[in-house]
């Protein structure tokens, strides 16, 4: 269903002060400037729709230029509780507290929010990424240590008149950026509390949020250059499908990944790429300006629509799933990494997908909207697309029901 509802105050139009408030690049995440404490301490914070904690570096670390100094904030309150977040690779741990938080290039409000002060971490901060913390924008169900810790966005909506919605436009550069270029580059926009029409073209199409934990959606069909992968649609969502700005790649369940790679290989068979390319290990390069985009297929994901038996599709180009990488050894060429990878935790629609689209996280109406991004990288022959409606039956059957256990869910 397209975006044809009556206007609601504060939900539409122009949000000039928030446009271009993100920096970064797909490989190391997109970050927004935030201030914490009194007097305000400025930090760059990774925007992550795949987690639900607001957590910031609060102790010296070799990869951090600055960190949150609680002792300097007159408004800091200690919750006298620790938090430990293990990942499949790495972890962070810290101490919970609350403090006053605002977003300089966001809504003109200050909120008291929960903050995890990271005191120890392993494989969490990234050297050269330029961010010092993470803003988990997903739901309380996956917050650590448990769902009683209110996430930042919930606090924001509760304490202010900001509508319960945010939207993201992540702008991939289309070429590798060195450190100084990243610091100077525009990475996109996080519009808090609304939708900015200047950031997209065409119509917004919405898919239901299946369950409010991650931003879980249902994929009902996958096509490579218009060719259906013809898999049981449950496979596409095994064990879930999520929209995650904190992940670089489009990650697919093993069976789906293998089928997709087989199909992409077949479509691009005019060139013989090494096995290591499909694994994300080897780069492929072409002389500057000669990348044969046309030999690579487009990839379409059909998402459940808002109306029964109706779906819509989002289509990305190789310009989204081939990620430019700078390598001094081959600096005279344009080199790329294959940015689709295998997952054991379901489909993750990371930056590779999001860089093609303006994505609306309409929490108030439990839905996610997609429109073609005004900043997506394309060529003169093809463009990313959001199209519908399509008739698709039995879409509810595409969702996988995860067996309930007491074990923690957030092992990314």
């Amino acid at each position: 269903e397209t975006d044809e509802e009556p206007e609601e105050p504060g939900r539409r139009g122009s949000f000039v002060e928030m446009v271009d408030n993100l920096r970064g690049k797909s490989g190391q995440g997109y970050y927004v400037e935030m201030t914490v404490g009194s007097p305000p301490q400025t930090l760059n914070i990774l925007v992550d729709t795949g987690s639900s904690n607001f957590a910031v570096g609060a102790a010296p670390h070799p990869f951090l230029h600055r960190y949150y100094q609680r002792q300097l904030s007159s408004t800091y309150r200690d919750l006298r509780k620790g938090v430990y977040v293990p990942y499949t690779q790495g972890k962070w741990e810290g101490e919970l507290g609350t403090d006053l938080v605002s977003i300089p290039h966001g809504p003109n409000v200050t909120v008291r929010a929960n903050i995890a002060a990271i005191t120890e971490s392993d494989k969490f901060f990234i050297n050269g990424s330029n961010w010092e913390g993470i803003l988990g924008l997903a739901y309380a169900e996956i917050a650590r240590p448990d769902d009683s810790l209110e996430p930042f966005f919930d606090s924001l909506v509760k304490q202010t008149h900001v509508p319960n919605l945010f939207s993201l436009q992540l702008c991939g550069a289309g070429f590798p950026l060195n450190q100084s270029e990243v610091l100077a580059s525009v990475g996109g926009s996080m519009i808090i509390g609304g939708i900015d029409h200047s950031l997209y073209t065409g119509s917004l199409w919405y898919t239901p949020i299946r369950r409010e934990w991650y931003y879980e959606v249902i994929i009902v069909r996958v096509e490579i250059n218009g060719q259906d992968l013809k898999m049981d649609c449950k496979e596409y969502n095994y064990d879930k499908s999520i929209v995650d700005s904190g992940t670089t790649n489009l990650r697919l369940p093993k069976k789906v990944f293998e089928a997709a790679v087989k199909s992409i290989k077949a479509a691009s068979s005019t060139e013989k790429f090494p096995d290591g390319f499909w694994l994300g290990e080897q780069l492929v390069c072409w002389q500057a300006g000669t990348t044969p985009w046309n030999i690579f297929p487009v990839i379409s994901l059909y998402l459940m629509g808002e109306v029964t038996n109706q779906s819509f599709r989002i289509t990305i180009l190789p310009q989204q799933y081939l990620r430019p990488v700078e390598d001094v050894a081959t600096s005279q060429d344009d080199c790329y990494k294959f940015a689709i990878s295998q997952s054991s935790t379901g489909t993750v629609m990371g930056a590779v997908i999001m860089e093609g689209f303006y994505v609306v996280f309409d929490r108030a109406r439990k839905r996610i909207g997609f429109a073609v991004s005004a900043c997506h990288v394309h060529d003169e022959f093809r463009t990313a697309a959001v199209e519908g409606p399509f008739v698709t039956l039995d879409m509810e059957d595409c969702g996988y029901n995860i067996p309930q256990t007491d074990e923690s869910t957030l092992m990314t």
Partner: antibody, heavy 116, light 107 residues
Framework: EVQLQQSGPELVKPGASVKLSCKAS?????NFWIHWLKQRPGQGLEW???????????KYNQKFKAKATLTVDTSSSTTYMHLSSLTSEDSAVYYC?????????WGQRTLVTVSA | DIVMTQSQKFMSTSVGDRVSITCKAS??????VAWYQQKPGQSPKALIY???YRYSGVPDRFTGSGSGTDFTLTISNVQSEDLAEYFC?????????FGGGTKLEIK
């Protein structure tokens, strides 16, 4: 400037194990996989395996699966190779190399000598 | 595993000459072949990738050619510093494999 700094020479007894290191600098460590290779006089170069520093995913040459274990520490941009149950056949020069297209960058070599 | 064969173990040449070193793959590897130079006591140095592309900083007297199963590294106007062993490598499929090497001797 991209550099791969390998640990120094090792003299080890048969049956023992050894852990070699390779510290990377001059590039974004998590962007490129690290490979390990073996060279013995008259036997050419052999690829042992590789590791992705972004998630510690490993892939090994079947021939070295029971011999080598690769690990990574992103906080120090260092990759390690643990060689177990050493025999005289493991006496060799070992290299780490960084991927890109093939292996554009190599470490300076580590000589391992297995001797009683 | 793909076998990379460098049939000439040694080649003798003179300064200023042109020399071609060959390498044969046991199966089609497309253009996914690299060439390395190794001087005694040193690590290999990358010269050529994708069969014919020079890495940054490699002198243009080194050229690579070939595709499929047959590959050649040509050094034109050989210099005394080119005295070294040269290896080909396929990175088309795992496990990555190398040729046995060709030692270039300067007369």
């Amino acid at each position: 400037e991209v550099q791969l700094q390998q640990s120094g020479p090792e003299l080890v007894k048969p049956g023992a194990s050894v852990k070699l290191s390779c510290k990377a600098s001059g590039y974004t460590f998590t962007n490129f996989w690290i490979h390990w290779l073996k060279q013995r006089p008259g036997q050419g170069l052999e690829w042992i395996g590789m590791i992705d520093p972004s998630d510690s995913y490993t892939k090994y040459n079947q021939k070295f699966k029971a011999k080598a274990t690769l690990t990574v520490d992103t906080s120090s941009s260092t990759t390690y190779m643990h060689l177990s149950s050493l025999t005289s056949e493991d006496s060799a020069v070992y290299y780490c190399a960084r991927s890109g297209v093939a292996f554009p960058y190599w470490g300076q070599r580590t000589l391992v000598t297995v001797s009683a | 595993d793909i076998v990379m064969t460098q049939s000439q173990k040694f080649m003798s040449t003179s300064v200023g000459d042109r020399v071609s070193i060959t390498c044969k793959a046991s199966q089609n590897v497309g253009t996914n072949v690299a060439w390395y130079q190794q001087k005694p006591g040193q690590s290999p140095k990358a010269l050529i990738y994708s069969a014919s592309y020079r890495y940054s900083g490699v002198p243009d007297r080194f050229t690579g050619s070939g595709s499929g199963t047959d590959f050649t590294l040509t050094i034109s106007n050989v210099q005394s510093e080119d005295l070294a062993e040269y290896f080909c490598q396929q990175y088309n499929s795992y496990p990555y494999t190398f040729g046995g090497g060709t030692k270039l001797e300067i007369k």
